[in-house]
């Protein structure tokens, strides 16, 4: 029972985590304009991995995609790659773990096969979570570096005649979503790996083999060796766990005939 619960919970936690990683990757608020120096701005800038957006005084939000590949910073490309790898690994992990779930019967699949699949999906979830955490952390580090660089530029080299306030960017909501989602995927992966240990067959009975020694009529039967993983019992109780993640996008402006790009 405990193994099924651990496996099911691991699956659900990973599912929520991967949905979060996908949401974070798609979100536009990876970096948002720091309003500390300009709290009264009517034009609010924020940026994602794929496009940058500007919310204007009319409430209209204009987003423009990064239509260049070579012109983008290497760090941004690296973050994109990490997030995509995380999503791909997570998606494959989910697919594998569905078939590995103890509560789902697929033909005559042995417990040892399910254990292997559970371990595989667990490792995939762990790597997926690490990719997401790494991607978000690299971006956050990039933001911190740029923030202090622009702060230094703001107060030097202008001879006191500061007319243009340089836009500084701070952490956006997507970073926090990414960190939490990566953490959840990682935890889910660890839970799957733990469940795997309990899924391995509890007993391996070896068939008795007769050894006939010449001149002796003695049969030697080796005793049954008990193989134990030490983690929980292999129960037949079936429990279905359901889980999901839902994200809401509150960007309230949609292109209309009055919008100019």
């Amino acid at each position: 029972m405990a193994v099924t619960a651990c496996q099911g919970l691991g699956f659900v936690v990973s599912l929520i985590g991967i949905a979060g990683i996908i949401a974070a990757t798609c979100m536009d608020q990876w970096s948002t304009q720091d309003l500390y120096n300009n709290p009264v701005t009517a034009v609010f800038n924020y940026q994602g991995l794929w496009r940058s957006c500007v919310r204007e005084s009319s409430g209209f939000t204009e987003c423009r995609g990064y239509f260049t590949l070579l012109g983008l910073p290497a760090m941004l490309q690296a973050v994109r790659a990490l997030m995509i790898v995380g999503i791909v690994l997570g998606a494959i992990g989910l697919l594998v773990s569905i078939f590995a779930l103890k509560c789902i019967r697929i033909g005559s699949m042995e417990d040892s096969a399910k254990a292997n699949m559970t371990l595989t999906s667990g490792i995939m979830f762990i790597v997926s979570g690490l990719c997401a955490i790494a991607g978000v952390s690299v971006f956050a580090n990039m933001l911190v570096t740029n923030f202090w660089m622009s702060t230094a530029n703001m107060y030097t080299g202008m001879g006191g005649m500061v007319q243009t306030v340089q836009t500084r960017y701070t952490f956006g909501a997507a970073l926090f979503v990414g960190w939490v989602a990566g953490g959840l995927t990682l935890i889910g992966g660890v839970m799957m790996c733990i469940a795997c240990r309990g899924l391995a067959p509890e007993e391996t009975n070896y068939k008795a083999v007769s050894y006939h020694a010449s001149g002796h009529s003695v049969a030697y039967k080796p005793g049954g060796f008990k193989a134990s993983t030490g983690f929980g019992s292999n129960t037949k109780n079936k429990k279905i766990y359901d889980g999901g993640a839902r994200t809401e996008d509150e960007v309230q402006s949609y292109p209309s005939k009055h919008d100019y790009v």
């Epitope: 701005t41 009517a42 034009v43 940026q47 005084s57 306030v165 309230q252 949609y254 009055h258």
Partner: antibody, heavy 115, light 113 residues
């Protein structure tokens, strides 16, 4: 087509309040902020503030805080501006404006404060 | 608050002549996020509401005659009417659309000589 239709002219006594309405049509009401601007006779334009019809969020010019209150009714796509404690210097034409770059303005509402 | 200073206060030009209106802001109106200057020009005819002419300092609103053009960046902006027509008699306002409170220039009255 897009229209912002304001309520008619008002004549009020000093100390009274007035509520001016602005009905929007021809576009998705919750997609754009509705701003208000004051134009005193023969004078320039002064920004009063805006309301976000999507979530009722408001922002005011410091000068008009306590003087103007913006509200909205999404069911009728109407925004209201209430001016309190009227004085003679509040006599002006008040405009509501919306859409990108304020491409559309109401026809204006003349509020006259006279004893 | 950003102060918008328009000059001249009034301008009398002959039909077909060029009219130039200047607008200066006390702070830059250039948004680094999209490299656009958030300065807007409006035309107000007597007894009417202002009408949008130019946004982003130089982009003409659809339906506005091409004799109207805007230029400038940062803090200095110009509205030019290349060949003034009788229907261009109006007051022209520039507006800071970059920072709250949104502020307007004092206006420039264009008349025919």
């Amino acid at each position: 087509q897009v229209q912002l239709v304001q309520s008619g002219a008002e004549v009020k006594k000093p100390g009274a309040s007035v509520k001016v309405s602005c009905k929007a049509s021809g576009y998705t009401f919750t997609n754009y902020f509705v701003h208000w601007v004051k134009q005193a006779p023969g004078q320039g334009l002064e920004w009063i503030g805006y309301i976000n019809p999507y979530n009722d969020d408001t922002k005011y010019n410091e000068k008009f805080k306590g003087k103007a209150t913006l509200t909205r009714d999404t069911s009728t796509s109407t925004v209201y501006m209430e001016l309190s404690s009227l004085r003679s210097e509040d006599t002006a034409v008040y405009y509501c404006l919306s859409l990108r770059f304020f491409a559309y303005w109401g026809q204006g509402t003349l509020v006259t404060v006279s004893s | 608050d950003i102060v918008m200073t328009q000059s001249p206060d009034s301008l009398a030009v002959s039909l077909g002549e060029r009219a130039t209106i200047s607008c200066k802001s006390s702070q830059s109106l250039l948004n680094s996020g999209n490299q656009k200057n958030y300065l807007t020009w409006y035309q107000q005819k007597p007894g009417q509401a202002p009408k949008l002419l130019i946004y982003w300092a130089s982009t003409r609103e659809s339906g506005v005659p091409d004799r109207f053009s805007g230029s400038g960046s940062g803090t200095d902006f110009t509205l030019t009417i290349s060949s003034v027509q009788a229907e261009d008699v109006a007051v022209y306002f520039c507006q800071n659309d970059y920072s709250y409170p949104l502020t307007f220039g004092g206006g420039t009255k264009v008349e025919i000589k």
